[in-house]
Amino acid sequence: WELTILHTNDVHSRLEQTSEDSSKCVNASRCMGGVARLFTKVQQIRRAEPNVLLLDAGDQYQGTIWFTVYKGAEVAHFMNALRYDAMALGNHEFDNGVEGLIEPLLKEAKFPILSANIKAKGPLASQISGLYLPYKVLPVGDEVVGIVGYTSKETPFLSNPGTNLVFEDEITALQPEVDKLKTLNVNKIIALGHSGFEMDKLIAQKVRGVDVVVGGHSNTFLYTGNPPSKEVPAGKYPFIVTSDDGRKVPVVQAYAFGKYLGYLKIEFDERGNVISSHGNPILLNSSIPEDPSIKADINKWRIKLDNYSTQELGKTIVYLDGSSQSCRFRECNMGNLICDAMINNNLRHTDEMFWNHVSMCILNGGGIRSPIDERNNGTITWENLAAVLPFGGTFDLVQLKGSTLKKAFEHSVHRYGQSTGEFLQVGGIHVVYDLSRKPGDRVVKLDVLCTKCRVPSYDPLKMDEVYKVILPNFLANGGDGFQMIKDELLRHDSGDQDINVVSTYISKMKVIYPAVEGRIKFSHHHHHH
């Protein structure tokens, strides 16, 4: 018996087609993805093959203005239209709190939403009861297939699930649910979830009875043969893991942003054992036409986005200096504003010993693309912020050793004075540079804001300590020459859309007045260029 699994993960609000790098589509003939194009391909496969499931491994929420405006209603609407068969909860589904998940998505989805390792307690337990399930048995042709869901147990550090959801260890939580499915005589079981490729592989290895793992969170691209676009495969598709009980378990993921549709064919014997598995992600490029009816619906929903982007979010009473003359040479107040917003967006009081789990932010000055003039009645709009942050990136959470941070700050000024983008803006960090010293030895003071303290204060950076830092995904991926971050990071979790983070902060503060306040200093008077 053959099953076709179509799967997406980490779509992050890419409802419309995008450019090849998943940013805004400029030249339509070269654009990719989007729900209208995805629907065309899904329908084509559904018509051609008998036993097809369309699954999503989480993080539909967060990533473009679509989510900012529609807050998840767009996810329910278009996933319903595409007739998804099941979805696992990702960490970003909790970005607007539990209510922001329940009302727009859980109550409106016409498909089951799954997670076995999230347990509700207190008053939330009865409220959320039945709105997501640990597993779902799906009818496929004359057979049944069990789908068990899982979600990153780091979600309380990455999003806003509140205090009444407990995120258990994935493997511990999955095993009893799989065992239960086995007692119900369900002999074909897919683990569908959002904990990253390393955990996907562990689940394949450790959870007895799981036949296939369909994952997300780490944006992992797997491919067998010559890859069709820019993504470099992390391994073959499917990635085969030998389980502790000797079975070959296929593990798949489909990169991110709806650029690919994962396509996996599994052959089962009559006892539900996997005999063979093969496939590849399908690149959703312009050779696949956009479905006209879904496209028309997208265009209808788009109208509200255009209106939103010109509305006032808040006001500034000072000039927001995002000029390259400032932000690539010295502390600029636009950099301070953005870093303050990044930290504010990551406030999570999950431990009494810590005022927050993260206090530091770094931001490449080259990523700040425009100032905002306060002489327009102080008004700040989404449109203004899109000029400051035009690349459609995210502000991510990483863990780095102090020694890596030191290297990053040396890189920040290794060729100072040439107006290059690697000059770092900061938050929760005080740095002093001496430009009279040779490149690689210019950081003379680097103090960082404590987290395990009731009164935050600045302490010298410790080389062997592990620190959490919020930074643009561009830097986490080694952009602007920050190869040391990419090579040495100990953990990387994708965060919220950059513009959304800043816009939320401005809306919250109502009136802003960021200052230049001595976060970045130069000794020996080398701060004039």
Epitope: L53, K110, L131
Partner: nanobody
Framework: QVQLVESGGGLVQAGGSLRLSCAAS????????MGWFRQAPGKERVFVAA????????TYGDSVKGRFTISVDNAKNTLYLQMNSLKPEDTAVYYC???????????????????WGQGTQVTVSS
Amino acid sequence: QVQLVESGGGLVQAGGSLRLSCAASGRTFSRSTMGWFRQAPGKERVFVAAIRWIGGTTTYGDSVKGRFTISVDNAKNTLYLQMNSLKPEDTAVYYCAATAGGPYYLGGRDILYDYWGQGTQVTVSS
């Protein structure tokens, strides 16, 4: 909270009629299959009838065909089971069930249903 609440059960003479209702709340059911199952004392739970919430396609268990009619009122979010020509062997606790949506399904495999009511007792006396 997803809830299915049955009502309408009771004691009835053989040959009589009853109409069971099941009020569904807490989420959309528009791509769900809704079903009625029953369980007689000391017996397994068995399938009675099912209906697609949208479209209204139906299917019935062999023992009730021609006597029972399943229906939904979308506006009231309510499932019904009209039971005519009742027999003593129809005596059971009747459960309303629903799927969480997903693939098209119309049938009686109870493991494919995700939500269950508490049940309502139907007793048919001879």
